[in-house]
């Protein structure tokens, strides 16, 4: 516990002190006091440097003195033989004796008292920045006028902080400018402008004179500008070293002026003003800015329009332009929006065709549609090449956005029929020779596929069964083969209006207009064994001449069988109608004269016994197209005949093309259009 005074005596004092002793005393007086230690008696064995016996006085780490021998006072009015004055409040006294004393030594008597210290003068480091005031047990600092004492109670500074500038224009200077600025001060000035305006600071070089930097380049006094996370400075020296125009990009600016204790100069003066916050003229690819300006500032609005082929995608909605506003923070609104290449998406698939998976579906990409060759071709032209257009659609030069349509190739058998003389007198055939051949099982008859949805046959085939079961794609017509072939389901039967319906069809003598169409429920898929036959053109090129050859096919009666199991075919010449008239009817149901012959009928056959017969009805009489030798068209349909193995009569299809086209158009489905 600190005391104001005390006594220290060597062991056994005033008797002789013993040998081999080491004793220490820790003296402590209250803080703010020094210690006055004085000896009134000193009798200790003398030795060089007091090596044998001694009393040692230590202050902190410093030895203040080491005493031995005998001392007497120099002043007759004072008993003090030795004294020490320390400006600290702690002191240590240590007494040591060695193992022997040649004489009897009595030791020492000492006293200490707490003494006032003058902190203002007693130390190298001055405790106060300005005025120091000593008092017993302490000191206090004070400041000149206009200065105030900082919280550390030692340093004085001017009260230059707390000013907030909100005007759009203003001037700020260091304290006392142009007189020397106060030392040891930190001045903080705040500029706070309306959002959307940036603080722009302007200085003149000559309006700045601040204590220069030290040899390491560190400013001793400094001026710093802080705008958000950006800092300008520190600045110091004679003449402003920074840019004379500082665009802070912020509406808030803190100005910090820090001075030390020495080297005061005239200081600084600056002007500031609020500029509408500029927004950068960004390089937004693939777009145009409207209006175009050299500089955009707070509240400016631009319309950013994408170039052709580019779009702004926001969520699921694509747009060609957007508005952007220069915001108070110097950033554009909608800055995340970009003009991206238009994406036309995965191209739509088409029936009976395909499109290769595109490498890209973006603007400018090219895709190619192809039809499933050789069974389908592109009906509506355009070549099948589409490019991704600016409006986000796949576009063809000819068709625009309309998709190509793959329609069946007509009249081209996968394998040509090689005629072998063996229908009546005909040959075995493969369905690939006659892929248009349709089999009707009730009645046992034939028909011709003319497109995906329509079968052409004879009226007398369907007059008794308006819901015929039909098959395509099979050479043989055993039940098991038909089960594996394609069955066609009728939707509606259209018999030519000129066909006379009879109550007893078996007695028919008039086969004029023996033609009918069957509309199918579902489209037929074409392939090597299923493919339509062409219809005749309406030009005179399609008028048949006597001797013109045509092919007939079917599963009708042969020389050996009532019904063929495997498809049969024969090549027949067209003959004059009179040749058919001249043949005697095999099993007449009326007078020979009752049988009607009209220009709607073709007579053919008579050569090598080749003819169509019962069960072949409705099948096509296929003739090579005069304008395209690779194709066959249905010139006729097996209708009737006087006698198998002679001449047969065929419905002249050319005379019914208008009716066929009209019927199909009026009864087509939307997906077929």
């Amino acid at each position: 516990e600190p005391t104001m005074y005390g006594e220290i005596l060597s062991p056994n004092y005033p008797q002789a002190y013993p040998s081999e002793v080491e004793k220490s005393w820790d003296i402590e007086v209250p803080e703010g006091y020094g210690i006055h230690l004085y000896f009134t008696h000193l009798d200790i064995e003398l030795s060089e440097n007091c090596a044998y016996d001694s009393v040692q006085i230590i202050s902190g780490d410093t030895e203040e003195g080491r005493l031995c021998g005998q001392r007497s006072s120099n002043n007759p009015h004072s008993p003090i033989v030795e004294e020490f004055q320390v400006p600290y409040n702690k002191l240590q006294v240590i007494f040591k004796s060695d193992f022997s004393n040649e004489e009897r030594f009595t030791g020492f008597a000492a006293y200490y008292v707490a003494t006032d210290i003058n902190e203002c003068t007693d130390f190298v480091d001055v405790p106060c920045s300005h005025f120091c005031n000593n008092f017993i047990g302490g000191y206090f600092c004070s400041c000149p006028p206009e200065y105030f004492l900082h919280d550390d109670m030692k340093n004085c500074g001017v009260n230059c902080s707390g000013d907030v500038f909100t005007a759009l224009i203003g001037e700020i200077a260091s304290p006392n400018y142009p007189k020397p600025y106060p030392e040891n001060s930190r001045c903080e000035y705040q500029i706070r402008l309306e959002k959307g305006f940036q603080v722009v600071v302007t200085l003149r070089r000559e309006d700045f004179d601040v204590e220069a930097a030290d040899s390491a380049g560190n400013c001793l006094d400094s001026l710093v500008f802080v705008a958000g996370d950006r800092q300008f400075g520190p600045y110091c020296g004679h003449g402003f070293p920074g840019p004379l125009n500082i665009e802070t990009k912020s509406n808030a600016l803190d100005i910090i002026f820090q001075t030390d204790l020495t080297g005061q100069k005239k200081g600084w003066k600056l002007r500031y003003h609020g500029d509408p916050m500029p927004c950068p003229k960004e390089d937004t690819p693939n777009s145009v800015w409207e209006p175009a300006k050299a500089k955009y500032v707070f509240r400016d609005v631009v319309q950013i329009t994408c170039l052709d082929g580019f779009e702004v995608v926001e969520g699921r909605v694509g747009a060609t332009s957007f508005y952007s506003t220069c915001q108070s923070n110097g950033k554009w609104s909608n800055s995340k929006l970009k003009c991206q290449p238009v994406d036309c998406g995965i191209p739509e698939s088409i029936e009976n065709g395909k499109v290769e998976d595109p490498e890209s579906t973006l603007f400018g990409s090219v895709i190619r549609y192809t039809c499933e060759e050789p069974y389908y071709y592109m009906e509506n032209g355009g070549g099948g090449e589409y490019h991704c257009a600016g409006n986000g659609s796949w576009v063809n030069e000819v068709l625009g956005p309309e998709l190509p349509k793959c329609v069946p190739v007509c009249g081209v058998p996968r394998e040509p029929f090689e005629e072998k003389q063996r229908i009546i007198g005909g040959s075995d055939a493969d369905i690939k020779n006659f892929p248009w051949q349709v089999f009707f099982d009730n009645p046992w008859a034939g028909g011709a596929l003319i497109n995906e949805y329509w079968v052409l046959t004879a009226a007398h085939v369907v007059e008794g069964n308006r819901e015929p079961t039909m098959y395509v794609g099979s050479t043989s017509v055993q039940t098991s083969r038909l089960a594996k072939s394609k069955m066609l389901t009728p939707e509606h039967v259209f018999i030519h209006p000129g066909w006379k319906l009879l109550e007893v069809p078996e007695g028919r003598t008039n086969f004029d207009n023996d033609i009918a169409l069957v509309r199918l429920k579902d489209p037929v898929k074409m392939g090597p064994t299923v493919s339509p036959i062409c219809l005749p053109g309406t030009s005179s090129d399609y008028n048949l001449m006597d001797g013109d050859l045509g092919l007939i096919s079917g599963w009708g009666r042969t020389e050996k069988r009532d019904r063929a199991v495997r498809l049969k075919a024969a090549r027949l010449p067209v003959a004059p109608l009179r040749k058919c008239k001249e043949v005697k009817v095999e099993k007449p149901t009326a007078d020979a004269e009752a049988y009607v012959f009209t220009p709607n009928m073709i007579c053919a056959g008579g050569e090598k016994g080749m003819d169509s017969c019962k069960g072949d009805s409705g099948g096509a009489f296929a003739v090579q197209d005069p304008n395209d030798k690779t194709k066959f068209y249905a010139a006729g349909l097996v209708s009737w005949g006087p006698q198998c193995g002679t001449y047969g009569l065929y419905t002249r299809v050319k005379n019914y093309v208008d009716w066929i086209m009209k019927t199909m158009q009026e009864n087509s489905t939307p997906r077929e259009d």
Partner: antibody, heavy 118, light 107 residues
């Protein structure tokens, strides 16, 4: 007159191959569907394979599918049967037959014997 | 596959006898059936096609009948040259199949 002559038969080890030929004459070969039919010693007839006039359509018995291949060369009036991966159960007299019309075999060859044995 | 069951597998009859062979299909084959005759060491010969049609040049003592699954082959008056094995053959579906054969002998 119509003649069908088979050749190419003989002794072969199991797993081996043989190619049978059938030379046709006396009729228009390309006019007819053709078949191979076999008869194991002392057993009944077994249909093996069938080919259309042009050669584009072919059918096989389950027992030979994937191992035997039927083909024809209309220019040479010849029918062929390539037999691979032969097994002991393929031992038989192999006939080529003309399908007169609708699966009725009206003309047959004299047959060629194929023996599969190790 | 369509199985063709022929019976009897063999028979012995006298010259002039009426001989009947039956063939049963494992499923309906309509009239898609032929009958063949094979003499020892010879190739088969077509006798009847489409179940009941007599092939050109075949003696009229041979006949066939039936439809669906049950078929009959008849020799109205057995002759010595008729000694042979007779096979039925269906062509309704692939694979084409033959009956096991009926061996006809003279008593």
């Amino acid at each position: 007159q119509v003649q069908l002559v088979e050749s190419g038969g003989g002794l072969v080890k199991p797993g081996g191959s043989l190619r049978l030929s059938c030379a046709a004459s006396g009729f228009t070969f390309s006019d007819y569907y053709m078949s191979w039919i076999r008869q194991a010693p002392g057993k009944g007839l077994e249909w093996v394979s069938y080919i259309s006039r042009s050669g584009s359509t072919k059918y096989y018995a389950h027992s030979v599918k994937g191992r035997f291949t039927i083909s024809r060369d209309n220019a040479k009036n010849s029918l062929y049967l390539q037999m691979n991966s032969l097994r002991a159960e393929d031992t038989a007299v192999y006939y080529c037959a003309r399908d007169e019309t609708d699966y009725a075999y009206d003309e047959w060859g004299q047959g060629t014997l194929v023996t599969v044995s190790s | 596959d369509i199985q063709m069951t022929q019976s009897p597998s063999s028979l012995s009859a006298s010259v002039g006898d009426r001989v009947t062979i039956t063939c049963q299909a494992s499923q309906d084959i309509s009239n898609y059936l032929n009958w063949y005759q094979q003499k020892p060491g010879k190739a088969p010969k077509l006798l009847i096609y489409d179940a009941s049609n007599l092939e050109t040049g075949v003696p009229s003592r041979f006949s066939g009948s039936g439809s669906g699954t049950d078929f009959t082959f008849t020799i109205s008056s057995l002759q010595p040259e008729d000694i042979a094995t007779y096979y039925c053959h269906q062509y309704e579906d692939y694979p084409l199949t033959f009956g096991g054969g009926t061996k006809v002998e003279i008593k």
